[in-house]
Interface confidence: low
């Protein structure tokens, strides 16, 4: 029912109610007299300066004379209403003041209002390599001779042939030669939809330019490539064999969601399948530094360990909601989860045998594995005070680091040591 | 040869509405962006609103916002613009242009006029 | 919203000419900039992209330059058919947003 409310819904305060939550509703207050009839009622929804606010009305009927309902904003004018604007309004530059006014000596008449608010566009991306395993490592660590990501995804695809082992490219049959422009897309290969084997090699490229200057995210929410098939993405727009590999996906992803950052506003992505392949290829989105899909909820300020730094660096999914994984940097993906008390996480994912399990910050990234599954210590952008943090994202006690012992699963605590501590 | 061919336009009443077309042809339509750019008689050019590949995103300029939809048809490869409460400074010739951002064909435009 | 602010509004030149305008972001905007042609009664064609890069089919006696906030298109010998207003064109911010156009004319 599209009135029905499924979001956090603040009735009037004094003082203001301030609204921490991305989404959520308001409405009038209840009123039986006019001694219970609030004459002002504020809220306060919070965000940052890059932020618009989206307000939908469900119902907006004051009573114009002695009921007001402003909206207040740091880059538009005040907004005056008493009756429902054609279309949602979109409040740009953080916080929202609403403020219902009411100047009637009796219950007001109106029959009052409902809406609706949401925060959108806020991300920025990390300077980062996402691994197969879905652990982040930095993009300078990419085809340096290390594995970082602890699976060697991030040293796959470095050779300087750009297309090992693959035939010549003919021209496709299907249009797939494709420059997208938007801030953020979809885009499929073109046997995705309709599943079609092809007698002869088919080679695509999609240019990702927004023309703007910031980093993309390209996402690959389906892969299903054929033996033999592979994805390339190139960071820069091209051709190919000019532009530094970001990775390369062959049918070894096929079933993985794996997210790809540029080091650069634009980016190619090269599919190429051999004759008669058996695989429907790739669904894939993008979207610059600063956007986050329509679908997808903005990461932001949190409760969890490093709330306050690298604020809004990700979105996540519907689907990365609750999961277990910290997909935000400050656990935003992973707050106010069913079946955990406020302020605590999941171990795992809802519905998951883990799921039960709770912890609370302190117990995140402190060396001391509180989940059955490890949940607690992975993917560690920080580490509690007192502890180490590994190139690949787990942490162990400080005074382990340089003892001649590795202890990080990568041996990072052994690395850049100046001196040898002495043995205790 | 790219082509694009913007119809639907003419004189509506202040408050009324149109419905504009682009039929493209030349280039694969669904690997486009495509926007709706106006000029008002003597003015400038100015954005109207822009629709990725698969319909969305649609973006729109405040002064259209809530009053105009932009939308595509990738089957027939047409674009479309329907104006809804027509205002006299909605007055111009409208083009309908290829991609997104970096406009590299544009129809010869259809102009609407908003008078009563 | 980022303002395009051209400079100047129109000119007069005769054929042969070096002719610059100029166009300023009211933020910087990198190297993303369009330029346009348009004749009267004409729908506008596209020029230059990325303040620098020449469409394709565009004679050469067209260039442009700048990044930032300050950007030039220059006309090094100007033609009797480049007489026409000129836009510039900012595409990494919606509303995508344009200069108020420059009328080049004849002496």
């Known amino acids: 029912h599209p009135d029905r409310i499924i979001f956090p819904n603040h009735a009037c305060e004094d003082p203001p109610a301030v609204l921490l939550e991305v989404q959520g509703t308001l409405q009038r207050p209840l009123v039986r007299d006019s001694r219970t009839s609030p004459a002002n009622c504020t809220w306060l929804i919070l965000g940052s300066k890059e932020q618009t606010v989206t307000i939908r009305f469900q119902k907006l009927h004051l009573a114009c004379g002695s009921e007001r309902l402003t909206l207040r904003s740091p880059l538009q004018p005040l907004i005056s209403l008493c009756e429902a604007p054609p279309s949602p309004l979109q409040l740009p530059g953080g916080n929202v003041t609403i403020t219902y006014s009411y100047a009637g000596a009796r219950a007001p008449m109106g029959q009052g209002f409902l809406l609706s608010y949401s925060q959108d566009w806020l991300m920025c991306l990390q300077e980062e390599f996402q691994c197969l395993n879905h652990r982040c490592v930095s993009a300078v660590q990419r085809c340096d001779g290390v594995d970082a990501c602890g699976d060697g995804s991030d040293e796959a695809g470095c050779s300087s042939d750009p297309f090992p082992g693959l035939t010549p490219r003919p021209v496709p049959s299907l249009p797939c030669n494709v420059t997208l422009e938007d801030f953020y897309g979809v885009f499929s290969s073109p046997g995705y939809t309709h599943l079609a084997s092809v007698s002869h090699p088919q080679s695509c490229h999609w240019l990702l330019d927004p023309h703007d200057g910031r980093r993309l995210a390209v996402r690959f929410t389906a892969l299903d490539l054929g033996f033999g098939d592979a994805v390339h993405v190139y960071d820069g727009p091209g051709p190919p064999e000019s532009s530094r590999l970001l990775r390369s996906l062959t049918h070894f992803s096929n079933g993985k969601a794996v997210t790809v950052e540029t080091l650069s506003g634009q980016a190619v992505v090269s599919y190429h399948t051999v004759a008669w392949s058996n695989g429907r290829g790739f669904n894939a989105t993008y979207h610059v530094r600063g956007y986050c899909l329509p679908w997808d909820r903005p990461c932001g300020l949190g409760s969890g360990l490093g709330a306050g730094e690298g604020l809004g660096e990700r979105c996540y999914s519907e689907a990365q909601r609750c999961d277990g994984s910290w997909d935000c940097a400050d656990g935003t993906d992973e707050e106010d989860c069913p079946g955990c008390p406020p302020g605590h996480f999941p171990c795992g994912a809802a519905g998951t045998s883990g799921a039960t399990a709770c912890y609370l910050p302190a117990d995140r990234c402190n060396y001391q594995t509180f989940c059955a599954d490890g949940a607690d210590e992975r993917r560690c952008r920080h580490c509690q005070p007192g502890n180490f943090r590994c190139r690949d994202e787990k942490c162990v006690y400080e005074t382990w680091v340089c003892d001649g012992q590795p202890d990080c699963a990568d041996g990072s605590d052994e690395w850049d040591c100046s001196y040898v501590l002495p043995r205790k | 040869e790219v082509q694009l061919l913007e119809s639907g336009g003419g004189l509506v009443q202040p408050g009324g509405s149109l419905r504009l077309s682009c039929a493209a042809s030349g280039f694969t339509f669904s690997s486009y962006a495509m926007s709706w750019v106006r000029q008002a008689p003597g003015k400038g050019l100015e954005w109207v609103s822009q629709i990725g590949t698969m319909g969305r995103p649609t973006t729109y300029a405040d002064s259209v916002k809530g009053r105009f939809t932009i939308s595509r048809d990738n089957s027939k490869n047409t674009l479309y613009l329907q104006m809804n409460s027509l205002r006299a400074e909605d007055t111009a010739v409208y083009y309908c242009?290829?991609?997104?951002?970096?406009?590299?064909?544009w129809g010869q435009g259809t102009l609407v006029t908003v008078s009563s | 919203d980022i303002q395009m602010t051209q400079s100047p509004s129109s000119l007069s030149a005769s054929v042969g000419d070096r002719v610059t305008i100029t166009c300023r972001a009211s933020q910087s905007i990198s190297s993303y900039l369009n330029w346009y042609q348009q004749k009267p009664g004409k729908a506008p064609k596209l020029l230059i992209y990325r303040a620098s890069r020449l469409q394709s089919g565009v004679p050469s006696r067209f260039s442009g330059s700048g990044s930032g906030t300050d950007f030039t298109l220059t006309i090094s010998s100007l033609q009797p058919e480049d007489f026409a207003t000129y836009y510039c064109?900012?595409?990494?911010?919606?509303?995508?947003?344009f200069g108020q156009g420059t009328k080049v004319e004849i002496k």
């Open positions: 064109q900012q595409p990494t911010s919606l509303p995508l947003t």
């Open positions: 242009a290829k991609s997104g951002k970096k406009f590299d064909y």
